[in-house]
């Protein structure tokens, strides 16, 4: 069953009500590096895009290297995931209201293209972590996320034995792994070449229309 975006009628070209998002999408010429594909229409500012590329950025004080240095090939997927989260104006159909101190809305069950999830897992499964859900349960006493007492660092593969375990479990089901492939117009691409436009616009239109039918 498809979730409805609670209390939202505007499912297309919208920004989520969260910590760093703009209230309205629009062009951002100076989006940094991996966030640059969204520069024609974005929910993030240039400074947000710059900051999220840093290790333990001030956006969330989140440390990717909580179990030693994360492999660069792995880290780029987390940066891309954060770009999608902060910058995409095409995730309206999956916005849900939440009662959290730091944000009023979140994404739920965004249908991530299966290849994007597979590649993320392949590039990360030898890096190390200590948790299978990164939304909660950290030790924040130092101001930065640390492994909670007794949580052992092991390979990603130990905590995320399959690609779906990673993509769906990591952020409490913000994503679900789609059966559709990149370019199908039926799944959200974390990675895309903006020279061909943003393929996620078509995906959002499809799911928004399907939701209005239900």
């Amino acid at each position: 069953t498809m979730c409805s975006a609670q209390d939202r009628t505007d499912l297309l070209n919208v920004c989520m009500d969260a910590k760093h998002h703009k209230t309205k999408p629009g062009p951002e010429d100076k989006l940094h590096d991996q966030c640059s594909p969204w520069k024609k229409n974005a929910c993030c500012t240039a400074s947000t895009s710059q900051e999220l590329h840093k290790d333990t950025s001030r956006l969330y004080n989140f440390n990717w290297d909580h179990c030693g240095k994360m492999e660069p090939a792995c880290k780029r997927h987390f940066i891309q995931d954060t770009c999608l989260y902060e910058c995409s104006p095409n995730l309206g159909p999956w916005i849900q209201q939440v009662n959290q101190s730091w944000r009023k809305e979140r994404f739920l069950d965004v249908p991530l293209c299966k290849e994007d999830c597979q590649r993320w897992w392949e590039d990360c499964h030898t890096s190390h972590t200590c948790k299978s859900n990164w939304h909660r349960g950290w030790d924040w006493t130092s101001g930065v996320n640390k492994c909670p007492a007794g949580a052992l660092c092991r390979t990603f593969e130990s905590y995320f034995p399959t690609p779906a375990a990673l993509c769906e479990g990591l952020w409490s089901h913000s994503y679900k792994v789609s059966n559709y492939s990149r370019g199908s117009g039926r799944c959200i691409q974390m990675w895309f070449d903006s020279a061909q436009g943003n393929p996620n616009e078509e995906v959002a239109r499809f799911y928004a229309a399907a939701m209005h039918v239900n």
């Epitope: 179990c67 030693g68 499964h125 030898t126 190390h128 200590c130 492994c147 007492a149 007794g150 949580a151 052992l152 660092c153 092991r154 390979t155 593969e157 130990s158």
Partner: antibody, heavy 118, light 109 residues
């Protein structure tokens, strides 16, 4: 650079105890499990047990249960393995090894030879 | 039972491919890890998990598994590969670990 440095060789009499140390450096000691594995001369590797260096929880092989005690000192980033009631068959090289995935040991100590002889 | 069984000895001609196997019930639900050990040295992890090589391990080493059998394959064996090879596996009940008996690999020629 990750390193596990073990204490030196020991000669013990039957019935005595031995305590081998393993000092870790180059990583956050409390974030990983440390296992102990031994190898008698010309024999296979034999798993003895492990300690969660973060909370001190231990698991031991049934073969050594009651005779082996694994501990750690987080302030010194050091794990210890104590084996009691030694017998000649305990003559072996004892290794500590860092665990990265339920039995995947990516770094090993250099080994400590314990000789049990009357 | 939580035993892992390996052939005691295997030989291969220089440059040829060799497969070393490890059998045991625990391998139906857990991956095997593979270690290389040369005389007088500590073991070295060569393959772990699904088929992961630690950095510094040549890509001629690969791992696979089917049912209750795990295999270590060395494609194009070198003289430097002559060593004892051990498999190990997690035993899910109780988070224990078990080692195989080891396979002595001889590289001929």
């Amino acid at each position: 650079e990750v390193q596990l440095v073990q204490s030196g060789a020991e000669v013990k009499k039957p019935g005595a105890s031995v305590k081998v140390s393993c000092k870790a450096s180059g990583y956050t000691f409390t974030s990983y499990a440390m296992h102990w594995v031994r190898q008698a001369p010309g024999q296979r590797l034999e798993w003895m047990g492990w300690i969660n260096a973060g909370n001190g929880n231990t698991k031991y092989s049934q073969k050594f249960q009651g005779r082996v005690t694994i501990t750690r000192d987080t302030s010194a980033s050091t794990a210890y393995m104590e084996l009691s009631s030694l017998r000649s068959e305990d003559t072996a090289v004892y290794y500590c090894a860092r665990d990265i995935s339920y039995g995947s040991f990516d770094y090993w100590g250099q080994g400590t030879l314990v000789t049990v002889s009357s | 039972s939580s035993e892992l069984t390996q052939d005691p000895a295997v030989s291969v001609a220089l440059g040829q491919t060799v497969r070393i196997t490890c059998q045991g019930d625990s391998l139906r639900s857990n991956y095997a890890n593979w270690y290389q050990q040369k005389p007088g040295q500590a073991p070295v992890l060569v393959i772990y998990g699904q088929n992961n090589r630690p950095s510094g391990i040549p890509d001629r080493f690969s791992g696979s598994s089917s049912g209750n059998t795990a295999s270590l394959t060395i494609t194009g064996a070198q003289a430097a590969d002559e060593a004892d090879y051990y498999c190990d596996s997690r035993v899910s009940t109780g988070n224990h670990v078990v080692f195989g008996g080891g396979t002595k690999l001889t590289v001929l020629g």
